[in-house]
């Protein structure tokens, strides 16, 4: 299980109003479209400048769009997706899942060097402390001779 | 790096045909829609067609039934076939990328912001 990757999923229902160029995003999958394996979801691919959802700040590149107006987005094509978010009117209604990356382990001592999440100064402190008794030993030693 | 390369274009007499070429590097090219915009001089830029991820083509009015938007994932390239050319297709010729699909318009629309364009190729009709 070393470098492994966890997510923090969270699921929001987010409310947009379409503005003057619509809801301001873009999304990729769907069934003959996989934008994650083994996965035929609808994704925010971009958020427009501008656009309805970036003044509302709540989507992100990268969630996964559950439903429209309560409307499943299990096993559509790309294009009935579309079609889908074109039609749902002035008031959208978006179930999203936002995926937050989390580090597995204490931060600021997982990498790729310290792959089993122990602390290098716990590896560190012991290690210098047998070299210094290692060498005290030593010198005493010689001085015996 | 990300890099849309145009080709193709050139001197051609009316009712002449070109074909042109777009090839992307730099991206994921499957997910993203590919259009064809043109500026002539003094004028301002304007798409003539586009084709989205999953291969649905645009056209404006003006070249509907004269040109053919085509895309070969494999290549990583769209191509713009040109047939019946007029004196007023004249112009340099764009390509430009936008990552998925607007949910709000098709990839014509003036809304539409390209994430990715290229440096051109010109078209003369004469």
């Known amino acids: 299980m070393n470098g492994r990757v966890d997510y923090l999923v969270t699921e929001e229902e987010i409310n947009l109003t379409r503005g003057p160029s619509g809801l301001g995003f873009n999304i990729v999958g769907g069934t003959d479209q996989q934008y994650v394996s083994n996965d035929s979801g609808i994704y925010v691919s971009r958020i427009k400048e501008n656009g309805a959802a970036a003044l509302d700040g709540r989507l992100q590149e990268g969630d996964k769009i559950l439903s429209v107006n309560g409307q499943d987005l299990k096993n559509l094509l790309h294009q009935d997706a579309v079609d889908l978010f074109r039609n749902a009117g002035y008031a959208v209604s978006l179930r999203v899942q936002h995926r937050l990356q989390v580090q597995n382990g204490p931060i600021g001592h997982r990498g790729e060097g310290d792959p089993s999440g122990i602390p290098i100064f716990m590896v560190l402190v012991p290690v210098f402390a047998l070299t210094m008794v290692a060498a005290w030993a030593f010198m005493r030693y010689r001085q015996q001779l | 790096q990300v890099q849309l390369v145009e080709s193709g274009g050139g001197l051609v007499q009316p009712g002449g045909s070109l074909r042109l070429s777009c090839v992307s590097s730099g991206f994921i090219f499957d997910y993203y829609a590919i259009g064809w915009f043109r500026q002539a001089p003094g004028k301002e830029r304007e798409g003539v067609s586009c084709?989205?991820?999953?291969?649905?083509?645009y056209y404006i009015d003006s070249v509907k039934g004269r040109f053919t938007i085509s895309r070969d994932n494999a290549k990583n390239t769209v191509y713009l076939q040109m047939n019946s050319l007029k004196p007023e297709d004249t112009a340099v010729y764009y390509c430009?990328?936008?990552?998925?699909?607007?949910?709000?318009?098709?990839?014509?629309?003036?809304?539409?912001?390209?994430?990715?364009w290229g440096q051109g190729t010109q078209v003369t009709v004469s």
């Open positions: 430009a990328a936008d990552f998925g699909s607007s949910v709000d318009s098709t990839c014509l629309s003036k809304e539409q912001r390209f994430d990715y």
């Open positions: 084709i989205s991820s999953v291969g649905r083509a």
